[in-house]
Amino acid sequence: TTSAEKNTCQLYIQTDHLFFKYYGTREAVIAQISSHVKAIDTIYQTTDFSGIRNISFMVKRIRINTTADEKDPTNPFRFPNIGVEKFLELNSEQNHDDYCLAYVFTDRDFDDGVLGLAWVGAPSGSSGGICEKSKLYSDGKKKSLNTGIITVQNYGSHVPPKVSHITFAHEVGHNFGSPHDSGTECTPGESKNLGQKENGNYIMYARATSGDKLNNNKFSLCSIRNISQVLEKKRNNCFVESGQPICGNGMVEQGEECDCGYSDQCKDECCFDANQPEGRKCKLKPGKQCSPSQGPCCTAQCAFKSKSEKCRDDSDCAREGICNGFTALCPASDPKPNFTDCNRHTQVCINGQCAGSICEKYGLEECTCASSDGKDDKELCHVCCMKKMDPSTCASTGSVQWSRHFSGRTITLQPGSPCNDFRGYCDVFMRCRLVDADGPLARLKKAIFSPELYENIAE
């Protein structure tokens, strides 16, 4: 029999008080962590890294800093105004030797459209990335560089889940040894060839992503080559065999009935905590119908919420979620009709998701009013439409050309939306701000490394 492969990267996920403030409850924060980890797990599991397959992720531990921890002197993430480099450094100053990777999720608006930052792995002589152990660096501090951070806010707007999931996959991609994609083969979204361009860029593209193009949640061949070399050398250092759920991480996994954490965290009358004996931990207590750790349709008194109680807010594209009275999980919401306007009239609903462009409502395709096409820079943050597969017809929604659809009304992109062919993001003044893909990384390296170690950090 072949021995089980070490293919699981165990994660430590922390969230700061601002992330908690945005999502509102521990359960909602845990649901966010879970959806992010599931998303990257799907991406990595379905990628063949030059023969290394089924790379998966598991949350080993979480720490949720609530608004109550905002003033706690032991909470390193309590400060309100921290730049992205400092924020990553605060994560790296903790000892993360027990984990493959350690991430902090936040809801901060970092400068220049930065959605995340992470140390880059390398096959040898690396300082950073997967399995990297805590050590002393030339700035005199011990650091763990198996770290990264992501934020869910950009230019004052919250990024869609699919973009945030890709950001996480992107930063973890750096940890796994991939630099940013470059060259024509690995940046098809920059191609002049329309057929290639329409599939978009890959996960490790240096600048902006919309998350809805075919390549957006796939690794390029460039990334696969780099990641496979790092996996070959590093995974035996800290990856584990996949299998048992981790009781105590606060997330209900296959084989558990509930998970309220360890005894010091468990505020749940319904679930046996992770300090209990093997046969009981992460099981429901006798006579209890459910545990709030299973989902939002369970009361603190361990009973299913009654039919008609709301468990998910109404959104642009889906009606509110309503408990059904016999499960703790929030049932799927009914979708609103396709082509309902969403995201402040810049997009339309497709199958319950705010996914299509407003252009699609009129049988048109979205295009970029990109400056390379001789368009006015002022139009870079307009929603622009063109006839299908005909870029020569690309014009702003405010143009005479599309006045029969938009009545001369200029629809502007939401702040934080990709612009200028994914080279940047729109700010609140409707200026397209180019992403400085490697700036923060260079600054942080200079701050803590000797010059010969400058190679290993990336957004």
């Epitope: 879970s34 209900v252 996994e253 296959q254 084989g255 558990e256 009935e257 509930c258 099981k283 429901l284 006798p286 006579g287 209890k288 119908q289 299973q294 059904n324 499960t327 999980l329 049932p331 799927a332």
Partner: nanobody
Framework: EVQLVESGGGLVQAGGSLTLSCAAS????????LGWFRQAPGNEREFVAS????????YYADSVKGRFTISRERAKNTMYLQMDSLRPEDTAVYYC???????????WGQGTQVTVSS
């Protein structure tokens, strides 16, 4: 993928009893909840009872409470629904279903017909 197969349905007189079985094959159960649902002609499918696979905690719809008993036999990968004091309004196709982590009752059997005559 887990396959669920119901059996034990049939024709019974009001006040009588019947036991339904749901056998699971495929990946062994690590699902945390299994349930029975029913659908009468022209009606929506409705919840009847559920049980957690590991700790055997049970839950019943008000309409069957005190008359139906849900149980499971882990060694046989089988769940049961003991139905006593049956009424004509219990006539329906009965389905078993499993609820997985994060997926509310996403796998269903093909159903077994229960008819209660008055």
């Amino acid at each position: 993928e887990v396959q669920l197969v119901e059996s034990g349905g049939g024709l019974v007189q009001a006040g009588g009893s019947l036991t339904l079985s749901c056998a699971a094959s495929g990946r062994t159960f690590s699902s945390y909840r299994l349930g029975w649902f029913r659908q009468a002609p022209g009606n929506e499918r409705e919840f009847v009872a559920s049980i957690t696979w590991s700790s055997a905690n049970t839950y019943y719809a008000d309409s069957v409470k005190g008359r139906f008993t849900i149980s499971r036999e882990r060694a046989k990968n089988t769940m049961y629904l003991q139905m006593d004091s049956l009424r004509p309004e219990d006539t329906a196709v009965y389905y078993c279903a499993k609820e997985d982590v994060g997926k509310p009752f996403d796998s269903w059997g093909q159903g077994t017909q229960v008819t209660v005559s008055s």
